[in-house]
Interface confidence: medium
């Protein structure tokens, strides 16, 4: 806490400008009007304040807005956002995607901090659902964002938002999350033709049930081994050797290299040796 002191004569700041970097902390506290700061927040990023000076500016805004900052100020926080605590952010009502983008830009290149996680949570809750534009924005800044959500949170994602999801956005998703996302993807892409549909649905297939895999095996999709290895074991086990052969197409030879790993290992153990021999890969059931 900076103690209250009178502003020295001639040092009252008429505007937020670069001369303020040479103000001591107590001078900033005494000589910068909080309301002026709030209206000229966009200038702060153009001034290389030290961390300690930023603390003073934050303190001034906190005094001016004890119930939480208005969005007009939040949008222009810039680097001052890095000084906010999750508790500060919980007081905010952020509704504009532009505000969200501006603050995510400040944190760009860093891990998702507790502040950013709180900001996103406040924003999504305010919108009521994770719409396509929001998802587009969030996955652009944090490719792993979708997989950081719980299955319950993912259930609020409308199928239309799935179009914003890129394969890399699902890299760290576990089966429980894919179980939620797959039916939404299936619905989102249902009007596409066979090959285009497979390209889009491929990264979601870790949540696909057996009957959908059987259906895909009839469409000459040539699934690669990396995708096959991510399928649910319980969905793969009922597939016949013929169905797996059709599903993988030319990639079927890759089963040999994966024979000791799930789900291939478990699937092999469920098959008749005669059927496995038809593949000519030397797989032992």
């Amino acid at each position: 806490e900076v103690e209250k002191t009178a502003c020295p004569s001639g040092k009252k700041a008429p505007e937020i400008d670069e001369s303020l970097i040479f103000y001591k902390k107590w001078e900033l506290e005494a000589c910068v009007d909080a309301a002026l700061l709030a209206t000229q927040m966009d200038r702060v990023n153009a001034i290389p304040f030290t961390y300690e000076q930023l603390d003073v500016l934050k303190h001034k805004l906190d005094e001016l807005y004890p119930q939480g900052y208005p969005e007009s100020v939040i949008q222009h926080l810039g680097y001052l956002f890095l000084k906010m605590s999750p508790e500060d952010i919980r007081k905010w009502n952020v509704t504009s995607l532009e505000t969200l983008k501006a603050l995510l830009e400040v944190n760009k290149g860093h891990e998702m901090s507790p502040q950013v996680a709180t900001l996103i949570d406040r924003f999504v809750k305010g919108r009521g659902q994770l719409d396509k534009d929001t998802l587009d924005t969030l996955t652009a800044f944090y490719p792993g964002y979708l997989c950081s959500l719980s299955p319950e949170e993912l259930s609020s994602v409308p199928p239309s938002s799935i179009w914003a999801v890129r394969p890399q956005d699902l890299d760290t998703c576990d089966p429980r999350q894919l179980d939620v996302l797959y039916p939404k993807a299936r619905l989102a892409f249902q009007n596409m033709n066979g090959s285009e549909y497979f390209v889009k649905i491929q990264s979601f297939l870790g949540g696909a049930p057996t009957e959908d895999l059987k259906a895909l095996s009839q469409q000459n999709v040539s699934m690669d081994l990396a995708t096959f290895m991510k399928l649910r074991t319980d969905a793969v086990l009922p597939l016949t050797v013929a169905e797996v052969q059709k599903l993988l197409g030319p990639h079927v030879e890759g089963l040999k290299a994966e024979e000791r790993h799930r789900p291939v290992r478990d699937w092999i153990l469920r098959q008749r040796q005669d059927d496995l021999d038809t593949l000519g890969l030397g797989l032992q059931g």
């Epitope: 670069e18 290389p48 961390y51 300690e52 000076q53």
Partner: antibody, heavy 121, light 107 residues
Framework: QVQLQQPGAELIKPGASVKLSCKAS????????MHWVKQRPGQGLEWIGI????????NYNERFKSKATLTVDKSSSTAYMQLSSLTSEDSAVYYC??????????????WGTGTTVTVSS | DIVMTQSHRFMSTSVGDRVSITCKAS??????VAWYQQKPGQSPKLLIY???TQHTGVPDRFTGSGSGTDFTLTINNVQSEDLLDYFC?????????FGAGTKLELK
Amino acid sequence: QVQLQQPGAELIKPGASVKLSCKASGYTFTSYWMHWVKQRPGQGLEWIGIIHPNIGSTNYNERFKSKATLTVDKSSSTAYMQLSSLTSEDSAVYYCARRSSNYGDWYFDVWGTGTTVTVSS
Amino acid sequence: DIVMTQSHRFMSTSVGDRVSITCKASQDVGTSVAWYQQKPGQSPKLLIYWASTQHTGVPDRFTGSGSGTDFTLTINNVQSEDLLDYFCQQYSSYPLTFGAGTKLELK
């Protein structure tokens, strides 16, 4: 990797001016503040000033306000410092330096190679 | 301006020893202090920031401590390649200022 390349040396006559360059590579030049630091032989370091390549905002140490002018050329990712009315006191190594991450952390983990300026007739 | 005083311009040590280089700020700078190492004819290299946080790739034998006005860079098990110049810097307020440096020498 991140690099700040500076010419090795400049020999300048007293009273003249010199424009030192600092070519950045390996990062987005316009996203980070660039600082300039002076080091006289066998002495400590002095902070000269700072410039933001994107917004052109500059701030100077009071001691260098009438001596140094900082500019940038975004198209070539190069920062410049012009030193005017040179005297023997300006003979020194001049470094450009960059903080690689957070705003507010004004210490430097990326330094230029340094330019030795010698003022002599 | 905040003056950073490194009281020893030179310090003698032996390989394998532990040495502490001190830096005193003329006013409270919190933990906004960095330490640099400099080889002759080269640019400084960051060792420590925020008074005690080790920069990436810096050997564990280099540690920083202190807050307020008194700061220390400690080198445990000094190696021959550590016999160089060391500078402190404050970034609590402008203008940013450096210590005059301490040169580590062999006893």
